[in-house]
């Protein structure tokens, strides 16, 4: 009874299509698969950024797989062939591992890369990224931003840079069609007459960096002798009401400060008849139903009521 063996996949490689971190892992079937003609071969692929403690593992019947990586670091991957018992008429068989690595040869020292990269997707409409030049770089250094997300044929360069002292320090992006809920890849590289500049790679999802506009149309309505309803409206723009959380700050007679977080565009406040002045402001943020993270908006304009009977009047600002 000879032990059944299977070879690892051939020509295992990591291919960079120029998508700034979205890479292809591909391979060919193992040699001598003729013995297993009636058999569906599967492959177990493990991969990670170098330095990561955990491997990502997938099993596939394909000869390729795609995923996103951090190109600031190297990538390592390994793959082997799997045969379920039906292929061997006995027990499961797995091959030895085929291994490969990939990294972009870094140019320049780490200090030359951009510092404090910050990207904000304003009102889920306008993406703006800004950065500071690398430490100790000369004024002749210029940085260029490239971006890609699934749906674009190739990486695009920023066409509307924000400049300071002749240097690019930010990018205003054009309208980004169908770009949320998927990885958005950015590379900022640079050039200088003087010395090589290190590239930087960033990946995020746009819905997680949204900064909405503040709420508008703040109003008061007297509900009863001891209750006042505060109301506001969602800001203009593409973000639906179901995606907002709100934070309210209420000041009563310049002393009591109430803060509350709510999911709707109303808040009912208990008051006393002695209340002479009531002011509140609201800000908004995209909630957990629509994103994993977000940025609070600026506070709305302040809305105040002073000394008037709220049953007679609803204040609008």
């Amino acid at each position: 009874d000879t032990e059944i063996k299977v070879n690892p996949p051939q020509d295992f490689e990591i291919v960079d299509p120029g998508y700034l971190g979205y890479l292809y892992l591909q391979w060919q079937p193992p040699l001598s698969l003729d013995h297993f003609k009636e058999c569906t071969v599967e492959y177990e692929l493990k991969y990670r950024n170098i330095g990561s403690e955990t491997w990502k593992t997938i099993i596939t019947k394909n000869l390729h797989y795609k995923d996103g990586f951090d190109l600031n670091k190297g990538i390592e991957a390994k793959i082997h062939t799997l045969l379920p018992w039906q292929c061997t008429n006995g027990s499961e068989v797995q091959s030895s591992w085929a291994e490969t690595t990939y990294w972009i040869s870094p140019q320049g020292i780490p200090e030359t890369k951009v510092q404090d990269m910050d990207c904000v997707y304003y009102n889920w409409q306008y993406l703006l990224c800004s950065w500071k030049p690398g430490i100790g770089v000369l004024l002749d250094t210029n940085y260029n931003l490239f971006y890609w997300y699934e749906g674009l044929d190739h990486a695009l360069q920023c066409v509307d840079y924000i400049k300071a002292d002749g240097q690019n320090i930010g990018c205003r992006f054009p309208y980004l069609e169908a770009s949320d809920y998927k990885d958005f890849y950015i590379c900022v590289n640079g050039s200088s007459e003087n010395k090589p500049i290190r590239s930087s790679y960033f990946t995020f999802q746009l819905q997680n960096i949204v900064k909405p506009l503040p709420p508008v149309y703040l109003t008061f309505t007297r509900e009863s002798s001891c209750e006042i309803k505060l109301k506001w409206s969602i800001p203009l723009g593409p973000i639906p009401a179901r995606c907002f959380d709100y934070e309210i700050e209420i000041r009563e007679d310049d002393t009591t400060l109430v803060t509350a977080t709510v999911e709707n565009e109303t808040y009912t406040l208990k008051t006393t008849n002695e209340t002479r002045q009531l002011c509140f402001v609201v800000r908004s943020k995209v909630n957990i139903y629509c994103s994993d993270d977000g940025i609070w908006s600026e506070w709305s304009d302040k809305q105040c009521w002073e000394g008037e009977d709220l049953s007679k009047k609803t204040l609008l600002r």
């Epitope: 569906t40 997938i58 099993i59 596939t60 379920p84 018992w85 499961e92």
Partner: antibody, heavy 121, light 108 residues
Framework: EVQLLESGGGLVQPGGSLRLSCAAS????????MNWVRQAPGKGLEWVSA????????YYADSVKGRFTISRDNSKNTLYLQMNSLRAEDTAVYYC??????WGAGAFDYWGQGTLVTVSS | DIQMTQSPSTLSASVGDRVTITCRAS??????LAWYQQKPGKAPKLLIY???SLESGVPSRFSGSGSGTEFTLTISSLQPDDFATYYC??????????FGQGTKVEIK
């Protein structure tokens, strides 16, 4: 006749633990990959975990990774799911399922009757 | 992850009707697709595997077709026993194994 019989479900508080078992009969258990699939009340099917025939390879959905552990005892023809740090969203009927063909997962040709896990305080 | 999208979510039909349910994968899954039938309070039952192979014991009025990203389950002449919820499932690449959200076939 192939049979899969789950047990071990019940009511547990958030943060608690449960161990589900699936007793298999009617086929050569040690030759087949096995899986757990769950279904929250009124919802669709959600794959939870897979284990290959020998038990040497295990796979998990992101929603349970680090909290659930799948294992098997081929001498007892039994599949297990150890569930720790349970959350309200883990409330579901849990099914064990036999893989028709494949290393870890595939088409599931036999399913157990399911065991209900309720996570509530 | 590979997303599976079924349509319609609900389908009203009469006994004897020809019924078609569609399943779309977010990327090519070759023919690695299964269809299941589930009745309330019961476990799912395998109908079709490898996109078009009929599971043993399943009536021949059930058939599956498609490859790549577009798949269909067809019931040639709907019977009273066929009113149930149907799920598609991909097993091309995992984890995770993914299911469609289900299609409920109800009496018109």
């Amino acid at each position: 006749e192939v049979q899969l019989l789950e047990s071990g479900g019940g009511l547990v508080q958030p943060g608690g633990s449960l161990r589900l078992s699936c007793a298999a009969s009617g086929f050569t258990f040690s030759r087949y990959a096995m899986n757990w699939v769950r279904q929250a009340p009124g919802k669709g099917l959600e794959w939870v975990s897979a284990i290959n025939a020998s038990g040497g390879s295990t796979y998990y959905a992101d929603s349970v990774k680090g909290r659930f552990t799948i294992s098997r005892d081929n001498s007892k023809n039994t599949l297990y799911l150890q569930m720790n740090s349970l959350r309200a969203e883990d409330t579901a009927v849990y099914y064990c399922a036999k893989v028709r063909y494949g290393w870890g997962a595939g088409a599931f040709d036999y399913w157990g009757q399911g065991t209900l896990v309720t996570v509530s305080s | 992850d590979i997303q599976m999208t079924q349509s319609p979510s609900t389908l009203s039909a009469s006994v004897g009707d020809r019924v078609t349910i569609t399943c779309r994968a977010s990327q090519s899954i070759s023919s690695w697709l299964a269809w299941y039938q589930q009745k309330p309070g019961k476990a799912p039952k395998l109908l079709i595997y490898d996109a078009s192979s009929l599971e043993s014991g399943v009536p021949s009025r059930f058939s599956g077709s498609g490859s790549g990203t577009e798949f269909t389950l067809t019931i040639s002449s709907l019977q009273p026993d066929d009113f149930a919820t149907y799920y598609c499932q991909q097993y091309d690449t995992y984890p995770p194994i993914t299911f469609g959200q289900g299609t409920k076939v109800e009496i018109k």
